[in-house]
């Protein structure tokens, strides 16, 4: 049967049952995915918008597939095996009474079973297996997969030690707390920080511990994935996004028409084919563009490059370089430079690094 041909898998809860608190639903579904990630190399991440690999739906009766639900009792839920579109999706019958405990139908236990199907498992003939076709409550605090469940899922995906550091060739969502995580581009947008990676961005609201992941296409459908550089001019409510030799202008979070435009309109020489990173400093009203081991400085008021550039990054940003992945400006005195999985807090008044951090330190990892 089909399997997911990647190890980073996204899920989204389309809607919530009124039988439970939203937080309890989130928790039950998260723990159900964790049951399977604990015994495989699979990593699951919840997204809140856009197309997830696995869509979790609560519905009653006819609900958009050939398998209408049958009211209370009988069929509790069903899930589709891995694949595109409806593939992987898990549907829960809203006519059941979903609970966190032994009364009604326990959502966590049902979700573990259905996610097994979403990952490609069929039913088991072992009555102790969670993949046994009939529902039976067991104490969720001591719940464990049976040997048969583990054998089944590991025959599809291997054990957790396999491929622990997979590259991300399929553009699936990277694990946020992976210590090796790097970013393609980072910028502030008002009081938020956007972290771009592949087709995703994480949104960090300043001073709040929570972050959410989204597809770039869910916010800006006309933009490509793989944004390589970004900067904000907050006073104008403008964000500039760069990929290859093109850039897009976002005003008040809306893409402007007649974009993308060529980066050469900024005055770059023809040999510049892409921008690695960019940051606007409102104190000087200048934007710094980082390309390979060099940087240019652009006067946003006069709309032209300052003379005397490019310059070497290592020469003018002590301890930074020779190349960087991303940079953003914060707190009126710092640039945060990203190089691979490392991040450097750089005081541009003192002109030195004041702190070395992991790139994902903003996420409470």
């Amino acid at each position: 049967g089909p399997v997911w041909r990647k190890h980073y898998i996204t899920y989204r809860i389309n809607n919530y049952t009124p039988d439970m608190n939203r937080e309890d639903v989130d928790y039950a579904i998260r723990k159900a995915f964790q049951v399977w990630s604990n015994v495989t190399p699979l990593k699951f991440s919840k997204i809140n918008t856009g197309m997830a690999d696995i869509l979790v739906v609560f519905a009653r009766g006819a609900h958009g597939d050939f398998h209408a639900f049958d009211g209370k009792g009988g069929i509790l839920a069903h899930a589709f095996g891995p694949g595109s579109g409806i593939g992987g999706d898990a549907h829960f019958d809203e006519d059941e009474f979903w609970t966190t405990h032994s009364g009604g139908t326990n959502l966590f236990l049902t979700a573990v079973h259905e996610i097994g199907h979403s990952l490609g498992l069929g039913h088991s003939s072992d009555p102790k297996a969670v993949m046994f076709p009939t529902y039976k409550y067991v104490d969720i605090n001591t719940f464990r997969l049976s040997a048969d469940d583990i054998r089944g899922i590991q025959s599809l995906y291997g054990d957790p030690k396999e491929n622990q550091r997979l590259p991300n060739p399929d553009n699936s969502e990277p694990a946020l707390c992976d210590p090796n995580l790097s970013f393609d581009a980072v910028t502030t947008v008002g009081n938020k920080i956007f972290f771009f990676k592949d087709r995703f961005f994480w949104l960090k609201v300043s001073e709040r511990p929570k972050t959410s992941v989204n597809l770039i296409s869910s916010l800006w459908p006309t933009l490509p994935s793989g944004i390589e550089a970004a900067y904000e001019i907050e006073a104008r409510n403008q964000v500039f996004l760069f990929k290859d030799d093109k850039y897009w202008l976002i005003s008040n979070l809306r893409p402007e028409p007649n974009y993308p435009k060529s980066i050469h309109s900024f005055g770059f020489p023809n040999f510049v084919k892409k921008i690695d990173a960019a940051v606007f400093n409102p104190r000087f009203y200048r934007t710094y563009f980082f390309v390979d081991n060099q940087y240019w400085r652009y006067d946003e008021r006069r709309q032209m490059m300052d003379p005397g550039y490019p310059k070497l990054i290592t020469k003018n940003f002590q301890g930074i370089g020779p190349k960087i992945d991303a940079v953003f400006y914060s707190k009126n005195k710092y640039y945060y430079f990203f190089q691979g999985s490392n991040q450097f807090e750089y005081d541009f008044l003192l002109q030195r690094i004041t702190k070395t951090l992991k790139s994902n330190s903003w996420f409470g990892c």
Partner: antibody, heavy 122, light 103 residues
Framework: EVQLLESGGGLVQPGGSLRLSCAAS????????MHWVRQAPGKGLEWVSG????????IYADSVKGRFTISRDNSKNTLYLQMNSLRAEDTAVYYC???????????????WGRGTLVTVSS | DIQMTQSPSSLSASVGDRVTITCRAN??????LNWYQQKPGKAPELLIY???SLQSGVPSRFSGSGSGTDFTLTISSLQPEDFATYYC?????FGQGTKLEIK
């Protein structure tokens, strides 16, 4: 190359019976749901019936329930539609269609046959 | 029961035009919507699945969007071979079809 070839259509009187066949090749037939979809002359598409990969589950449109029976023979890579108590409104081109899924039907038909015409008339 | 309403039922356009066909469900069908193209005397062909995914081999001038109850098929620049009938579909329910004709 995936191929679906329907046969068995023809002229039949109201109340009569007909059995359609669909010979499948170019894919592992026993892995997929299969469906029948029909199209009355000059009209739109109407889903008729579907059958799970193993043959154990069948589903029907209300308009044919109790009169039509879908079946399959995985050893012969063939899908069937037995049509009884035929009515004038069953006149249509009948297409066999392959689903992209096996355990639960996605309702997504990625390959279709060319169709066979069934005419119910006295 | 779920019903699908497709509009318009017919449409006249010229080569190079941008054309939009809509499909509306009477309840949420998430992104479980497919689009097919049918030419006279031929079987339908899958164009778009899961609301917005382009079936392999289908030209990129075709695109789909929408989720929940409202869906759109767009042809960005009509080509002569695009004049056909288009159907939206969700499980066992097809829209009534939109016949796209040359103006």
């Amino acid at each position: 190359e995936v191929q679906l070839l329907e046969s068995g259509g023809g002229l039949v009187q109201p109340g009569g019976s007909l059995r359609l066949s669909c010979a499948a090749s170019g894919f592992t037939f026993s892995w997929y749901w299969m469906h029948w979809v029909r199209q009355a002359p000059g009209k739109g598409l109407e889903w008729v019936s579907g059958i799970v990969s193993s043959g154990g589950t069948t589903i029907y449109a209300d308009s044919v329930k109790g009169r039509f029976t879908i079946s399959r023979d995985n050893s012969k890579n063939t899908l069937y539609l037995q049509m009884n108590s035929l009515r004038a409104e069953d006149t249509a081109v009948y297409y066999c269609a392959k689903d992209i899924r096996g355990a639960y039907s996605s309702g997504l038909f990625d390959y279709w046959g060319r169709g066979t015409l069934v005419t119910v008339s006295s | 029961d779920i019903q699908m309403t497709q509009s318009p039922s017919s449409l006249s356009a010229s080569v190079g035009d941008r054309v939009t066909i809509t499909c509306r469900a009477n309840q949420s069908i998430y992104t479980y919507l497919n689009w097919y193209q049918q030419k006279p005397g031929k079987a339908p062909e899958l164009l778009i699945y899961a609301a917005s995914s382009l079936q392999s081999g289908v030209p990129s001038r075709f695109s789909g969007s929408g989720s929940g109850t409202d869906f759109t098929l767009t042809i960005s620049s009509l080509q002569p071979e695009d004049f056909a009938t288009y159907y939206c579909q969700q499980a066992g329910i097809f829209g009534q079809g939109t016949k796209l004709e040359i103006k």
